[in-house]
């Protein structure tokens, strides 16, 4: 999950395995101030999971969340 550095949440590691799409309710990008670009998925249990925006499944999920 993202760590807050000076109130800006940043990710220092990514999950590589796909999360169940049905478990994800929203997402956000971490700040450009962070050293690693990342997408943070928020699950239906309100857990925040850092993901690599270059992964295919991550891009696919972002697209479907945008459309829903």
């Amino acid at each position: 999950s993202p760590h807050a550095s000076d109130t800006t949440p940043c990710c220092f590691a990514y999950i590589a395995r796909p999360l169940p799409r049905a478990h994800i309710k929203e997402y956000f990008y971490t700040s450009g101030k962070c050293s690693n670009p990342a997408v943070v998925f928020v699950t239906r249990k309100n857990r925040q999971v850092c993901a690599n925006p270059e992964k295919k499944w991550v891009r696919e999920y972002i697209n479907s969340l945008e459309m829903s």
């Epitope: 999950i15 169940p20 799409r21 478990h23 699950t43 857990r47």
Partner: antibody, heavy 119, light 109 residues
Framework: QVQLVQSGAEVKKPGASVKVSCKVS????????MHWVRQAPGKGLEWMGG????????IYAQKFQGRVTMTEDTSTDTAYMELSSLRSEDTAVYYC????????????WGQGTTVTVSS | SYVLTQPPSVSVAPGQTARITCGGN??????VHWYQQKPGQAPVLVVY???DRPSGIPERFSGSNSGNTATLTISRVEAGDEADYYC???????????FGGGTKLTVLG
């Protein structure tokens, strides 16, 4: 080195249940996703379900929903797969598999457990 | 649900190149993993994320993914490569892992 060691072969009667265990060594069970895959004689691989650690939830293949239960005992680093209402078509080798090395794929597999359903 | 189609069998002479295909609708949008399974043994991951190779897997194994077809290529085929090969993807519509039906690679001679 990560290893998965499964319980021994089982012979069951139709209608019974079977519980297969998968003991993890080399890492903590809760860190990674544990999945179960089966293979009927002469057939291909079939995913049954798995645990999603980020979520704390288990997901099941629709085909097995209501008939399979996957659990984990973190105190012994052992995963379990229980399949109920067995029928002859459930005769298969059952594998546990996980992703500690190349996440997003099943990089480590157990040796397999043969389950035979016969009257 | 998502369907992966593999040829049941592929035959190749030792030293030649074997290509095993895995077909799926717009499969290039998915990460494809490949497993090798020898008789009586558990599957072994040989390629992940379309084209990456786990450590310990020879460079002779490579993967590609474009359009509706992913391909596992085994160059300079050896007798020890004879096995069943399975492709695998994550189907986000059903939240299921899906395997192809498998391809039996026979090394002639």
């Amino acid at each position: 080195q990560v290893q998965l060691v499964q319980s021994g072969a089982e012979v069951k009667k139709p209608g019974a249940s079977v519980k297969v265990s998968c003991k993890v060594s080399g890492y903590t069970l809760t860190e990674f996703a544990m999945h179960w895959v089966r293979q009927a004689p002469g057939k291909g691989l079939e995913w049954m379900g798995g645990f999603v650690p980020e979520d704390g939830e288990t997901i099941y293949a629709q085909k097995f929903q209501g008939r399979v239960t996957m659990t984990e005992d973190t105190s012994t680093d052992t995963a379990y797969m229980e399949l109920s209402s067995l029928r002859s078509e459930d005769t298969a080798v059952y594998y546990c598999a996980t992703d500690p090395l190349y996440e997003g794929s099943f990089s480590v597999w157990g040796q397999g457990t043969t389950v035979t359903v016969s009257s | 649900s998502y369907v992966l189609t593999q040829p049941p069998s592929v035959s190749v002479a030792p030293g030649q190149t074997a290509r095993i295909t895995c077909g799926g609708n717009n499969i290039e949008s998915k990460s494809v993993h490949w497993y090798q399974q020898k008789p009586g043994q558990a599957p072994v991951l040989v390629v992940y994320d379309d084209s990456d190779r786990p450590s310990g897997i020879p460079e002779r194994f490579s993967g590609s993914n474009s359009g509706n077809t992913a391909t596992l290529t085994i160059s300079r085929v050896e007798a020890g490569d004879e096995a069943d090969y399975y492709c695998q993807v994550w189907d986000s519509n059903t939240d299921h892992w899906v395997f192809g039906g498998g391809t039996k690679l026979t090394v002639l001679g």
